[in-house]
């Protein structure tokens, strides 16, 4: 199957990286994170039509079975293929500390 | 956040491993696979409510933003956390060959 990158549904409709501006309150982090106060959250959003950014063989199978049994098998879904790391300044019992997270911000997307 | 395993929507409704019986024709493999003729395809299906099998920090963020902006940010979705390998007997130009695929059958599931 072609690991297609052209969206048959029209520009911007298929699985891709989106940026959502969020505050600590939006993220539910206000009680344990001090900084940054706002985060540009990158996440994977969009439809996964046939052969579009298929992550692997499982995604191909899932799409074929979804076509056959749409009520039983959902279409593949748009999820991160990799992540960008991010460092947060956190509250601790003794003050503040730095902590790095490697699974927080999506870097690129595919359909699984 | 708790990495919960109890489904608040009722038994079997949340993200979990399902088995779907499929023929080579169902999978679109009839022209290049000889065996097995039928496959018990394991895949991840089900809802991803808050704190259920959250894969990582990104999944937590996505759920929090989904609650705030449901029209913009979709809920996390149920995808394989790991895979089981599978061997196929394939047709080749010269006859047949054995090929192992390590990304074909879901082994367990989580929400991303």
């Amino acid at each position: 199957a072609r690991n297609g990158d052209r969206c048959p549904l029209g520009p911007g409709r298929c699985c891709r990286l989106h940026t959502v501006h969020a505050s600590l309150e939006d993220l539910g982090w206000a009680d344990w994170v001090l900084s940054p106060r706002e985060v540009q959250v990158t996440m994977c959003i969009g439809a996964c039509p046939s052969q579009f950014r298929e992550a692997n063989m499982h995604a191909q199978i899932k799409m074929n079975l979804h076509r056959l049994k749409p009520d039983t098998v959902p279409a593949p879904c748009c999820v991160p293929a990799s992540y960008n790391p991010m460092v947060l300044i956190q509250k601790t019992d003794t003050g503040v500390s730095l902590q790095t997270y490697d699974d927080l911000l999506a870097k690129d997307c595919h359909c699984v | 956040a708790r990495n919960g395993d109890r489904c608040p929507l009722g038994p079997g409704r949340c993200c979990r491993l399902h088995t779907v019986h499929a023929s080579l024709e169902d999978l679109g493999w009839a022209d290049w696979v000889l065996s097995p003729r039928e496959v018990q395809v394991t895949m991840c299906i089900g809802a991803c409510p808050s704190q259920f099998r959250e894969a990582n920090m990104h999944a937590q963020i996505k759920m929090n933003l989904h609650r705030l902006k449901p029209d913009t940010v979709p809920a996390p979705c149920c995808v394989p956390a790991s895979y089981n390998p599978m061997v196929l007997i394939q047709k080749t130009d010269t006859g047949v060959s054995l090929q192992t695929y390590d990304d074909l059958l879901a082994k367990d599931c989580h929400c991303v």
Partner: antibody, heavy 119, light 110 residues
Framework: EVQLVQSGAEVKKPGESLKISCKGS????????IGWVRQMPGKGLEWMGV????????IYSPSFQGQVTISADKSISTAYLQWSSLKASDTAMYYC????????????WGQGTLVTVSS | QSVLTQPPSVSGAPGQRVTISCSGS????????VNWYQQLPGTAPKLLIY???NRPSGVPDRFSGSKSGTSASLAITGLQAEDEADYYC??????????FGGGTKLTVLG
């Protein structure tokens, strides 16, 4: 254009105090952390600490905790590094650097301030 | 002693390809990211590669980064005289936060 402009070279005697500065321009100063990095003569880079200019939260490398103080004045977009009692071993080039958006790397650097401590 | 280990020096002729290694452990490079900086003689460091393999705008594609296990490497192809500089890897370590390698001096021969 993003710029970090540091104060000029300093020559001091052991035991004296010192405060060097780093002025940011061309971006929202409070939206990015500022770090300080030491480079002793002929040596490599050492991370000293970081400040969030917005909330003035500071975190120090264990090697520099209690040896220096990092501060910021967001009204004039300036970060500071200061010593209350200098030692000869503080002789080095000191760089301020802006953290990238995710706080994992330094995307812009000041030109450096050379501090010489000698009796 | 740096937490991240780099060779003190490497060299290559103009047009050649050179690589600079950066060895860490499971508490830094092994689980996280690596950034690379170039420091030309008498100047401040400059970001060259971030998050293992990403180039900031303005950095030529002759420079590339990669990571495998607990090691990372910086590759420079089509070596040029102006590439002569010190190169530093940087990562994160849970005990000391931001850590740098000891630096590698690149000499362009000829």
């Amino acid at each position: 254009e993003v710029q970090l402009v540091q104060s000029g070279a300093e020559v001091k005697k052991p035991g004296e105090s010192l405060k060097i500065s780093c002025k940011g321009s061309g971006y929202s100063f409070t939206s990015y952390w500022i770090g300080w990095v030491r480079q002793m003569p002929g040596k490599g880079l050492e991370w000293m600490g970081v400040i969030d200019p917005d909330g003035s939260y500071t975190i120090y490398s264990p090697s520099f905790q209690g040896q220096v103080t990092i501060s910021a004045d967001k009204s004039i977009s300036t970060a500071y590094l200061q010593w209350s009692s200098l030692k000869a071993s503080d002789t080095a080039m000191y760089y301020c650097a802006r953290y990238g958006r995710y706080g994992t790397y330094f995307d812009y650097w000041g030109q450096g301030t050379l501090v010489t401590v000698s009796s | 002693q740096s937490v991240l280990t780099q060779p003190p020096s490497v060299s290559g002729a103009p047009g050649q390809r050179v690589t600079i290694s950066c060895s860490g452990s499971s508490s830094n490079i092994g689980v996280l990211y690596v950034n690379w900086y170039q420091q030309l003689p008498g100047t401040a460091p400059k970001l060259l590669i971030y998050s293992n393999d990403n180039r900031p705008s303005g950095v030529p594609d002759r420079f590339s980064g990669s990571k495998s296990g607990t090691s990372a490497s910086l590759a420079i192809t089509g070596l040029q005289a102006e590439d002569e500089a010190d190169y530093y890897c940087q990562s994160w370590d849970s005990s000391s936060n931001y850590v740098f390698g000891g630096g590698t001096k690149l000499t362009v021969l000829g």
